[in-house]
Interface confidence: medium
């Protein structure tokens, strides 16, 4: 194991500020893998909160492995949190479209789609089943609708998807009770705010599907679900468009939608998920 020869460190009583991880894989233990090469690499050490050197065997391992100290810092420390610069033509894309693919730390093997900012296309990847980030879509179409540019280079302005369980998040069940709204937007807009499992206190916004508004909440810094936006505007862009107000059994108003998929009626109390 790559850590076996490491010098022992000492716990002190000094209280460090809360650790905020950019990506869930930054919490992985350094993994040299089963192969026997001797390759100098860097990993983020959650105990020292620094990027450190380790010897990589050349195969397998995990994502907490970087070619350079700079790359490690860029991915795992908050100093580089604002490293993603969007061009004018990309202003309408939600921030999460620019996140790298992140399979998370679990061991599932689920086909998902992410927007690759290098190729400017949505691509398939294997998701572990937990954590990861919001650049994670159940269908290629959903990914394209939200993150890919239209033919003229501007953001495609149509969201539409079926309601599916994402990341085992709580999803409302269909009900016979008439609802005030019907939803045709991204499925995660229906999930409750989920603080996640880390210990930071970041100001974020989530779409409250009960009241049809974006509301602030405190995000822990990792985990949680996709109903998590860095600004109210981004939240509204992603989720507000999906709701169509129902005024009577026979009529709908406020619709900007051209394409519709399976309608899901929602009538449920607001739920504050309290799971680490």
């Amino acid at each position: 194991d790559s850590e076996e020869d490491e010098e022992h460190t000492i716990i002190t009583d000094t209280e460090l500020p809360p650790l905020k991880l950019m990506h869930s894989f930054c919490a992985f233990k350094a993994d040299d893998g089963p192969c026997k090469a001797i390759m100098k690499r860097f990993f983020f050490n959650i105990f020292t909160r620094q990027c450190e050197e380790f010897i990589y065997g050349g195969c397998e391992g995990n994502q907490n492995r970087f070619e350079s100290l700079e790359e490690c810092k860029k991915m795992c420390t908050r100093d580089n949190a604002n490293r993603i610069i969007k061009t004018t033509l990309q202003q309408e894309k939600p921030d999460f479209c620019f996140l790298e693919e992140d399979p998370g730390i679990c061991r599932g093997y689920i086909t998902r789609y992410f927007y690759n900012n290098q190729t400017k296309q949505c691509e398939r990847f294997k998701y572990g089943g937990c954590l990861g980030n919001m650049n994670n879509f159940e269908t290629l179409e959903e990914c394209k609708n939200i993150c890919e540019d239209g033919p003229n280079g501007f953001q495609v302005d149509n969201y539409g998807t079926q309601l599916n369980a994402v990341n085992n998040s709580l999803t409302p069940q269909s009900t016979k009770v008439p609802s005030l709204f019907e939803f045709h937007g991204p499925s995660w807009c229906l999930t409750p705010a989920d603080r996640g499992l880390c210990r930071a206190n970041e100001n974020r916004f989530y779409y409250n599907s009960v009241i049809g508004k974006c509301r602030p909440f405190k995000y822990s810094g990792c985990g949680g679900n996709e109903n998590n936006f860095t600004s109210k505007q981004e939240c509204l862009r992603a989720c507000k468009k999906g709701f169509i107000q129902r005024i009577s059994k026979g009529g709908l108003i406020k619709t900007k939608r051209k394409r519709k998929k399976q309608r899901v009626k929602i009538a449920y109390e607001e739920i504050f998920v309290k799971n680490m």
């Epitope: 209280e15 809360p18 210990r199 309290k274 680490m276």
Partner: antibody, heavy 119, light 107 residues
Framework: QVQLVESGGGLVQPGGSLRLSCAAS????????MNWVRQAPGKGLEWVSA????????SYADSVKGRFTISRDNSKNTLYLQMNSLRAEDTAVYYC????????????WGQGTLVTVSS | DIELTQPPSVSVAPGQTARISCSGD??????VHWYQQKPGQAPVLVIY???KRPSGIPERFSGSNSGNTATLTISGTQAEDEADYYC??????????FGGGTKLTVL
């Protein structure tokens, strides 16, 4: 001196309720996630529940989910465990313990309080 | 989710090296922590982050982790080291998981 002191244990009948408290001192309680760990007589350690520093997120072992509630009052430097619908198998010494930042191990433990569920 | 398996008991002569194992599927990919518990007392952290020693813990305590087994090593075991030892890690949701415990007997 960093210290955790549990209280509230005792004898309770099956189906009954009990509320454990843990008074923290010697450190900035509001900066730390906390958890409860229990140990049945002659048995090993079993994690019960955890709560983040600001109380905004909690987690429970499957064995207590829906019956136990962890909470905290940072103004009083106190951690709580509300235990409802108690069963004989909940009989144990309950330890209050501190998580250091992110590490998910417990670096400070209380002395424990005994909860006995028996008719 | 990860399950941690420890031998129920380990015996060692004074001055010898005691090794307590903790097995779990791909445990090398997780940080493992170790606690010592003496009768009637609360547990004490002896190793964290697989191989890091808290202040106040003697140098004879060390930890390692490879393959599917993490190991707590006590070199030059002393009578006062006789206790129960528990390994601990976390599951996929970062919930705490303990091993079943190992009773270390110093002969």
């Amino acid at each position: 001196q960093v210290q955790l002191v549990e209280s509230g244990g005792g004898l309770v009948q099956p189906g009954g309720s009990l509320r454990l408290s843990c008074a923290a001192s010697g450190f900035t309680f509001s900066s730390y996630a906390m958890n409860w760990v229990r140990q049945a007589p002659g048995k090993g350690l079993e994690w019960v529940s955890a709560i983040l520093s600001d109380g905004s997120s909690t987690s429970y072992a499957d064995s207590v989910k829906g019956r136990f509630t962890i909470s905290r009052d940072n103004s009083k430097n106190t951690l709580y465990l509300q235990m409802n619908s108690l069963r004989a198998e909940d009989t144990a010494v309950y330890y209050c313990a501190r998580y250091p930042d992110w590490g998910w191990y417990t670096d400070v433990w209380g002395q424990g309080t005994l909860v006995t569920v028996s008719s | 989710d990860i399950e941690l398996t420890q031998p129920p008991s380990v015996s060692v002569a004074p001055g010898q090296t005691a090794r307590i194992s903790c097995s779990g599927d791909n445990i090398r990919k997780f940080y493992v922590h170790w606690y010592q518990q003496k009768p009637g007392q609360a547990p004490v952290l002896v190793i964290y982050g697989t191989n890091k020693r808290p202040s106040g813990i003697p140098e004879r305590f060390s930890g390692s982790n490879s393959g599917n087994t993490a190991t707590l090593t006590i070199s030059g075991t002393q009578a006062e080291d006789e206790a129960d030892y528990y390994c601990q890690s976390y599951d996929s949701k970062f919930n705490t998981v303990f091993g079943g415990g190992t009773k270390l007997t110093v002969l």
